[in-house]
């Protein structure tokens, strides 16, 4: 057993450009407090777990009001250390999260408002009993300077707080098989203290607080003789009285896992899978409650009013994990339909829709022609999220409002002359050509390449385009 101690030295603007605005103002005075969360190990999956080594909340710092026009200085800090007690061995490698919180003290509806100013995280190796380790971490434009250490609570000593020391009973030497306790040479390493109540005849331990059974005995305290009436789980030597194989003491016999933990055998011992809210070798340590603030990113802590009840984090949109510690890339689910652009704003998801589509997820296909009138007898044609007008003869433009010059495109072939006409255009063809656009040559023998011209029109007459 022992205590992890964290000393915050300063929290303020980091070096370099872009100094942050002061978090407090004359209108909105505030004060800081800190939260630390510890997890065992260096592995990435530690992020999924709750603060299994423990968590602590600092006191509130002094009230701070920004001086108008002044840059944000180092902010006034709470007094004292943040202390995280641990019951089991110190793991040697650990992950930490340190959060700096602001408490606004203005007139708030529904009490004070809290907001997270900065969060730093890291993974470190640390031996218990060593000196203070200093650290500097940056979060955005803020900088946090702090020191930390792990120390054992007597009588535990050692880099993992697993060795126990007692004052020497004799002035000169320790008992048989027991070494002096470095660095406390006047103390001796104590024999291991097994779990309270562990049978001295049938139990033993290799770790403090353990109770392992000798063959033929079982139960959490090794006080229950193994039944010889059943031969279903042969594990031990043959019993002379029954001819059965007496089940030897399997590591999970009597389920050493407390608080509803489930036991699984490992090659060397056993492993407990603990329910939420419990941890430790045998799930014997509880105490992560909602008061410890285990839910990150604004998650609501549901349940967990006392150490015996589990908590569940109800996460805000965009976060998941048992402690809301994982940001979800919600755009990877491609929620925007019809080619919309997805924007994850953190607190909300936005879809920027292509022309012709609308709705929170661009799910509505707009009727491009709805409410769009094409003037002068034009008709609206839908297409690709935009509308266009197919204009009646003599009109053009986006809405057919412009009067078209039918001769602008030089529609009369072979040198024919174009005349604008109220119903369109008329081509006056050059000699030797005919047709609405003067596109057909007249044959030298007087026959045309077309059927005979309509009655009343001779070749060479202006041909009106209808």
């Amino acid at each position: 057993a022992g205590v992890f101690e964290l000393q915050i030295h300063s929290f303020g603007p980091g070096p370099g450009p872009g100094a942050p605005r002061s978090p407090c103002s004359a209108r909105l005075p505030c004060r800081l407090f800190f939260r630390v969360c510890l997890k065992p190990g260096l592995s990435e999956e530690a992020a999924e777990s709750p603060c299994a080594l423990g968590a602590a909340l600092s006191a509130r710092g002094p009230v701070y009001t920004e001086q108008p026009g002044a840059p944000a200085p180092d902010l006034p800090l709470p007094d004292g250390l943040l202390q995280v007690p641990f019951r089991d061995a110190w793991p040697g490698t650990f992950s930490f999260i340190i959060e700096t919180w602001r408490e606004e003290l203005g007139d708030q509806i529904g009490g004070p408002a809290w907001s997270l100013l900065a969060r730093v995280a890291g993974r470190r190796r640390l031996a218990a009993g060593g000196p203070w380790a200093r650290d500097i971490q940056r979060a955005g434009a803020w900088e946090l300077r702090f020191s930390y250490r792990a120390r054992c609570e007597p009588p535990a000593v050692g880099t993992a707080c697993t060795r126990l020391c007692r004052p020497r009973s004799a002035p000169s030497r320790c008992g048989p098989g027991l070494r002096p306790c470095a660095p406390l040479e006047d103390e001796c390493e104590a024999p291991l203290v097994c779990r309270a109540g562990c049978s001295p005849e049938h139990g033993f331990c290799e770790q403090p607080g353990e109770c392992r059974c000798l063959e033929g005995w079982t139960g959490p305290l090794c006080t229950v003789p193994v039944s010889t009436s059943s031969c279903l789980s042969p594990r031990g030597p043959s019993s002379a009285t029954t001819g059965c194989l007496v089940p030897g003491p399997g590591p999970c016999d009597g389920n050493p896992c407390a608080n509803g933990g489930s036991c699984s055998e490992t090659p060397r011992s056993f492993e407990c899978t603990c329910p939420r809210g419990f941890y430790g070798l045998r799930c014997e340590v509880s105490g992560v409650t909602c008061a410890d603030g285990p839910c990150f990113n604004g998650g609501l802590c549901v349940g967990g009013a006392d150490p015996d009840s589990a908590y569940i984090c109800h996460c805000p949109p965009g976060f998941q994990g048992s402690n809301c510690e994982k940001r979800v890339d919600r755009c990877s689910l491609q929620p925007c339909r019809n080619g919309g652009l997805c924007l994850d704003l953190g607190h909300a998801l936005r879809c920027r829709c292509r022309a012709g589509f609308a709705g929170p997820r661009c799910e509505h296909d707009l009727d491009d022609c709805a409410g769009r009138a094409c003037a002068n007898g034009g008709t609206c044609v839908e297409g690709g999220g935009a509308h266009r007008c197919s204009c009646a003869l003599g009109f053009g433009g986006r809405d057919c409002r412009e009067r078209a010059d039918p001769c602008a495109a030089r529609p009369c072939a072979h040198g024919g002359r174009c005349y604008a006409h109220f119903s369109g255009l008329v081509c006056a063809c050059a000699p030797g050509y005919m047709g609405a656009r003067c596109e057909f040559p007249v044959h030298p023998d007087g026959a045309s390449a077309l059927p005979a011209a309509p009655p009343g029109l001779r070749p060479g007459d202006p041909q009106r385009y209808l």
Epitope: Q108, I109, G110, G111, A113, S115, L116, L117, R119, N297, G298, L300, H314, P316, P317, G318, F319, R327, G346, H347, A348
Partner: nanobody
Framework: EVQLVESGGGEVQPGGSLRLSCAAS????????MGWYRQAPGKQREWVAV???????TVAPSVKGRFTISRDNAKNTVYLQMSSLRAEDTAVYYC??????????????EGQGTLVTVKP
């Protein structure tokens, strides 16, 4: 400003049922959770059930299977259906709303509370 008005509390025998309602008025930010927390005399306050604006629900393990939460977004109302009530469910039940503005900024609102008493 958000106002929350609870109703439906009262006295009930063990094994009985009650339905609490909470109506929110005022302007509620669209990204939020509405729910119920309770406080028994001398105990920590405890969120019992929460439902987000996107429909996700969370119920405390201690009441799972007995309490259900539902929400009518159109009416900005949240309901807590409590059945198989036990003596340990006796508490003042408060309606609460958490508005999330970002991952580091949110605000809580709470109602006046309604007393639920479970006794034989």
């Amino acid at each position: 400003e958000v106002q929350l008005v609870e109703s439906g509390g009262g006295e009930v025998q063990p094994g009985g049922s009650l339905r609490l309602s909470c109506a929110a008025s005022g302007s509620i930010f669209s990204i939020n959770a509405m729910g119920w927390y309770r406080q028994a005399p001398g105990k920590q306050r405890e969120w019992v059930a929460v439902v987000s604006s996107d429909g996700r629900t969370t119920v405390a393990p201690s009441v799972k299977g007995r309490f259900t939460i539902s929400r009518d977004n159109a009416k900005n109302t949240v309901y807590l259906q409590m059945s198989s009530l036990r003596a340990e469910d006796t508490a003042v039940y408060y309606c609460g709303v958490r508005e999330w503005y970002s991952d580091s900024d949110w605000r809580d609102y709470e109602g006046q509370g309604t007393l639920v008493t479970v006794k034989p």
